[in-house]
């Protein structure tokens, strides 16, 4: 089959890293620097991706494979093959059009990327809050009050002490 195919199409003999030159009696010419062909039988070489600016080179281009980029520190990849770099934020923040903003009360973000997400609503599962949420961390739900054995101490955090001079609501 290979022999038959090569008789039909001389280009099938050209290996990866070369192109089949239609203008030179279909001889196999090497891809020039900064270009590649990842399969045999190609009539063109692909121009290598260049990792510039906020992109940095994770893997150099070779005659048979494209370069791979990632992002410089302070940025992270987005899109297939790291097609974009997006600015990192701190935990407890999200990236907006105006830059990094703290998560609103009741939301959190435990990563340097992505958006702030609402705290888990423990009561939807019939549970109580074991550990309060913060901008950086979700709440931790504990067992429901009914699950507590008699005499067990309450898992709900104690109410904050009232400041002197403040009457109860």
């Amino acid at each position: 089959f290979e022999r038959t195919r090569s008789l039909q199409d001389p280009c099938s003999n050209c290996p990866a890293g070369t192109f089949c030159d239609n203008n030179r009696n279909q001889i196999c010419s090497p891809c020039p620097p900064n270009s590649f062909s990842s399969a045999g039988g190609q009539r063109t070489c692909d121009i290598c991706r260049q990792c510039k600016g906020v992109f940095r080179t994770r893997k150099e281009c070779s005659s048979t494979s494209n370069a791979e980029c990632d992002c410089t520190p302070g940025f992270h990849c987005l899109g297939a093959g790291c097609s974009m770099c997006e600015q990192d934020c701190k935990q407890g923040q999200e990236l907006t059009k105006k830059g990094c903003k703290d998560c609103c009360f009741g939301t959190f973000n435990d990563q340097k990327r992505g958006i702030c997400r609402p705290w888990t609503n423990c009561s939807l599962d019939g549970k109580s809050v074991l550990v309060n949420g913060t901008k950086e961390r979700d709440v931790v739900c504990g067992p429901s009050p009914a699950d507590l054995s008699p005499g067990a101490s309450s898992v709900t955090p104690p109410a904050p002490a009232r400041e002197p001079g403040h009457s109860p609501q």
Partner: nanobody
Framework: EVQLVESGGGLVQPGGSLRLSCAAS????????VGWFRQAPGKEREYVGT??????HYGDFEKGRFTISRDNSKNTVYLQMNNLRPEDTAVYYC???????????????QGQGTQVTVSS
């Protein structure tokens, strides 16, 4: 938006020379192979050549008369044409692609072209 602008065309006598220029705005040539094509009245578009990374590839008609070069500082690619013949009369187009050579390729962007007329 990328714009390619060709210049340098005109009327030249047989045996004469011309240098066509292709300037890019909106993007540099850094990431692209640059090619030249030509189209004579009533004829198919014809591949002239491609330049990438110091290497040039040419169509089979030009027989060493045409040379493609590049000036990085001016973001311009040139097509030097020597010993011109009447059959070289055509509109010459500059184009860019992520493929090398561009002989069998539809370019990503192409200019409006510049007219070259070879006549005595």
């Amino acid at each position: 938006e990328v714009q390619l602008v060709e210049s340098g065309g005109g009327l030249v006598q047989p045996g004469g020379s011309l240098r066509l220029s292709c300037a890019a705005s909106g993007r540099t040539f850094d990431n692209y192979a640059v090619g030249w094509f030509r189209q004579a009245p009533g004829k198919e578009r014809e591949y002239v050549g491609t330049y990438w990374s110091g290497y040039a590839h040419y169509g089979d008609f030009e027989k060493g008369r045409f040379t493609i070069s590049r000036d990085n500082s001016k973001n311009t690619v040139y097509l030097q044409m020597n010993n011109l013949r009447p059959e070289d009369t055509a509109v010459y187009y500059c184009a860019i692609s992520l493929k090398y050579p561009m002989a069998t390729v539809t370019p990503d962007y192409q200019g409006q072209g510049t007219q070259v007329t070879v006549s005595s």
